[in-house]
């Protein structure tokens, strides 16, 4: 079991336990910060990030941000707490096992963001509409 001296002196945001006292391990996410990317006009892309990190806090999830402007395309991969906005946007899909990109309104650029909660899930970023549960045909399949 967990040594009692660990439980007594830790910060609440650094340790999450269940009813049996087992401690939740943080998410494993791709974490390359901002890198130039060749991902463009594709249904899905791999991050090409070779760094997988243990997120700092157990509540953090994996995030990917794809940005395109007149000069370049970048892909950002990080861990982030879904209770806090990222780039001024709420992480609505943080519980999703897949990183399904959603467009956000940002002046002067095309901006897509996704978040997810499975191992290295921000390695495979999905733009295709067929994965989007706002698609009525997909909802029909799910609920049949």
């Amino acid at each position: 079991t967990i040594p009692p001296h660990v439980q007594k002196s830790v910060n609440n945001d650094m340790i999450v336990t269940d009813n049996n006292g087992a401690v939740k391990f943080p998410q494993l996410c791709k974490f390359c910060d901002v890198r130039f990317s060749t991902c463009d006009n594709q249904k899905s892309c791999m991050s090409n990030c070779s760094i997988t990190s243990i997120c700092e806090k157990p509540q953090e999830v994996c995030v990917a941000v794809w940005r395109k402007n007149d000069e370049n395309i970048t892909l950002e991969t990080v861990c982030h707490d879904p209770k806090l906005p990222y780039h001024d946007f709420i992480l609505e899909d943080a519980a999703s096992p897949k990183c399904i990109m959603k467009e956000k309104k940002k002046p002067g650029e095309t901006f897509f963001m996704c978040s997810c909660s499975s191992d290295e899930c921000n390695d495979n970023i999905i733009f295709s509409e067929e994965y989007n549960t706002s698609n009525p045909d997909l909802l029909l399949v799910i609920f049949q």
Epitope: T1, K24, S118
Partner: nanobody, 124 residues
Framework: EVQLLESGGGLVQPGGSLRLSCAAS????????MAWARQAPGKGLEWVSL????????YYANSVKGRFTISRDNSKNTLYLQMNSLRAEDTAVYYC?????????????????WGQGTLVTVSS
């Protein structure tokens, strides 16, 4: 009864190295992911490194990447943490921990058994 016993801690100068060991007993060691965590004085618990059951996949916190190496010897039921280029901020009690369930995949990892810890002090 599951038991985890850490050893190898001590006082080391900045830039030095230490190798921590964790002897495991009471469970089928090679079926479980294992991890190292640490707690600095007055600070929260920080997960340092994770290793898959067979030892082929390893993961690290950004704070130790490139300096620490996790490994395991399943024939000896022992987990290791090689710590190089140690810094003052690495001073902490280091714990090894066993994952609660042997399942892999995308289930939430929870760790239910811990050693009593070994103190690492980095100071000149």
């Amino acid at each position: 009864e599951v038991q985890l016993l850490e050893s190898g801690g001590g006082l080391v100068q900045p830039g030095g190295s230490l190798r921590l060991s964790c002897a495991a007993s009471g469970f089928t060691f090679f079926n479980y992911e294992m991890a190292w965590a640490r707690q600095a004085p007055g600070k929260g618990l920080e997960w340092v490194s994770l290793i898959s059951a067979e030892g082929t996949r390893t993961y690290y916190a950004n704070s130790v990447k490139g300096r620490f190496t996790i490994s395991r010897d399943n024939s000896k039921n022992t987990l290791y943490l090689q710590m190089n280029s140690l810094r003052a901020e690495d001073t902490a009690v280091y714990y090894c921990a066993k994952r609660r369930d042997a399942s892999m995949g995308h289930t939430t990892r929870r760790f239910d058994h811990w050693g009593q810890g070994t103190l690492v002090t980095v100071s000149s």
